[in-house]
């Protein structure tokens, strides 16, 4: 996407507060890096309905982050 500067976060704004659990295909956690200084939670929706950013401060995001971290470590 040539219209975007390098070194930007993937999400625009704070993100949605919640996504229906039944609609979630996958959750990806992007940790702070040189490109983006905050954690981002990206939800892939079922049935090719695209992706949404989940507010990392929301209760649902905190649960997802915990779950992912437990699985990875």
């Amino acid at each position: 996407f040539p219209m975007f500067k390098r070194g930007r976060c993937l999400c625009i704004g704070p993100g949605v507060k919640a996504v229906k659990v039944a609609d979630i295909e996958k959750a990806s956690i992007m940790y702070p890096s040189n490109n983006c200084d905050k954690i981002e939670v990206i939800i892939t929706l079922k049935e090719n309905k695209g992706q949404r950013c989940l507010n990392p401060k929301s209760k649902q995001a905190r649960l997802i982050i915990k779950k992912v971290e437990r699985k990875n470590f």
Partner: nanobody
Framework: EVQLVESGGGLVQAGGSLRLSCAAS????????IGWFRQAPGKEREGVSC????????YYADSVKGRFTASSDNAKNTVYLQINSLKPEDTAVYYC???????????????????WGQGTQVTVSS
């Protein structure tokens, strides 16, 4: 009830300028990105800019970079689109839209947005 109301369109000569406004109500303004789109007769709706209400970050289509500037006044829940050096090909109905939880790759895609205004006509005469 969510409302987006555009204003500021009109008839202007090529080379002139316009400032479009989009007044939002019925939702938490800071939680949303506000996109500007345009649709010329017989053409598809085209994304021209997007602004994050929470931090003011802006995104533009290559075709309008340098001529279009989006800004927001969060105290008034209003987003502006300043259009300079207008060309006849800028003639279209201009719409603002609000979307939440967008990735930057979705910033200019109309299907990513949840709420839409009724549009304001911009006509550029040569």
């Amino acid at each position: 009830e969510v409302q987006l109301v555009e204003s500021g369109g009109g008839l202007v000569q090529a080379g002139g300028s316009l400032r479009l406004s989009c007044a939002a109500s019925g939702f938490t303004f800071d939680d949303y990105a506000i996109g500007w789109f345009r649709q010329a007769p017989g053409k598809e709706r085209e994304g021209v800019s997007c602004i994050s209400s929470s931090d003011g970050d802006t995104y533009y289509a290559d075709s309008v970079k340098g001529r279009f500037t989006a800004s927001s006044d969060n105290a008034k829940n209003t987003v502006y689109l300043q259009i300079n050096s207008l060309k006849p090909e800028d003639t279209a109905v201009y719409y603002c839209a609000a979307g939440q939880g967008l990735l930057i790759a979705q910033a200019l895609r109309w299907e990513s947005y949840d709420y839409w205004g009724q549009g304001t006509q911009v006509t550029v005469s040569s």
